[in-house]
Amino acid sequence: DAEFRHDSGYEVHHQKLVFFAEDVGSNKGAIIGLMVGGVVIA
């Protein structure tokens, strides 16, 4: 038998979290950021 489909509007939608560090020069230190879904938020 085929199964009846059960789903809901309450599924968890996962996004990729990407931490990155970028060297911006010898006297300026580094920028550390958190990218969520393509947008830098920190």
Partner: antibody
């Protein structure tokens, strides 16, 4: 509040094709997790599930009736339509449309039923 | 198709007494997602069925706590701890795991 109301031709002749309409309010069939089924009940007898349509237009049918049934939805009109071909007197029954809604993940139930519409197939 | 067999067919009960209805599935109705979609409905004369219990043992909103559901796999039970006059009608079990979805034949609860 959620309401569903069925309408149909009432009396049809054998071999004809008919459409039953479920008009609903209080929810949207474009909302993830929503669905509507048609269920019928011959007078004084048991219940038989016919077909179900989901919010994303996926459909499931009772295999024994699939060749004669088509379920469709018009989200803008808040309606679900069941079309039955080649009707026979054994199709005489009260037809209910029923909402199936999700309250949480994989936690869905047929929570609201219409009042039903009586279909009589007779020559 | 999954055959749902309800017993008894008729259940005469006195007010205030307990009542129990059995529902047996011809095969397991555990869904591949791990849930068991067994529901109980009450249909009063001249009305549409109303949901009492979903997923075996969960009372639907507004359903009195005298109603309880239990079971697993293929064997399920609806119990009413103390029958009231408003409980009269036909009770149906319903499996929503396998297509086609199928109902039990119904149990008519009546007052002695």
């Amino acid at each position: 509040q959620v309401t569903l109301k069925e309408s149909g031709p009432g009396l049809v002749k054998p071999t004809q094709t008919l459409s039953l309409t479920c008009s609903f309010s209080g929810f949207s069939l474009s909302t993830s997790g929503m669905g509507v089924s048609w269920i019928r009940q011959p007078s004084g007898k048991g219940l038989e599930w016919l077909a179900h349509i989901y919010w994303d237009d996926d459909k499931q049918y009772n295999p024994s009736l699939k060749s004669r049934l088509t379920i469709s939805k018009d989200t803008s009109k808040n309606q679900v339509v069941l079309t039955i071909t080649s009707v026979d007197p054994v199709d005489t029954a009260t037809y209910y449309c029923v909402r199936r809604a999700s309250s949480s993940r994989y936690d869905d139930q047929f929570d609201y039923w219409g009042q039903g519409t009586l279909l009589t197939v007779s020559s | 198709d999954v055959v749902m067999t309800q017993t008894p067919l008729s259940l005469p009960v006195s007010l205030g007494d307990p009542a129990s209805i059995s529902c047996r599935a011809s095969q397991s109705i555990v869904h591949s997602n791990g849930n068991t979609y067994l529901e109980w409905y009450l249909q009063k004369p001249g009305q549409s069925p109303k949901l009492l219990i979903y997923r075996v043992s969960n009372r639907f909103s507004g359903v009195p706590d005298r109603f309880s559901g239990s079971g697993s796999g293929t064997d399920f039970t609806l119990k009413i701890s103390r029958v009231e006059a408003e409980d009269v009608g036909v009770y149906f079990c319903f499996q929503v795991t396998h297509v086609p979805l199928t109902f039990g034949g119904g149990t008519k609860l009546e007052l002695k």
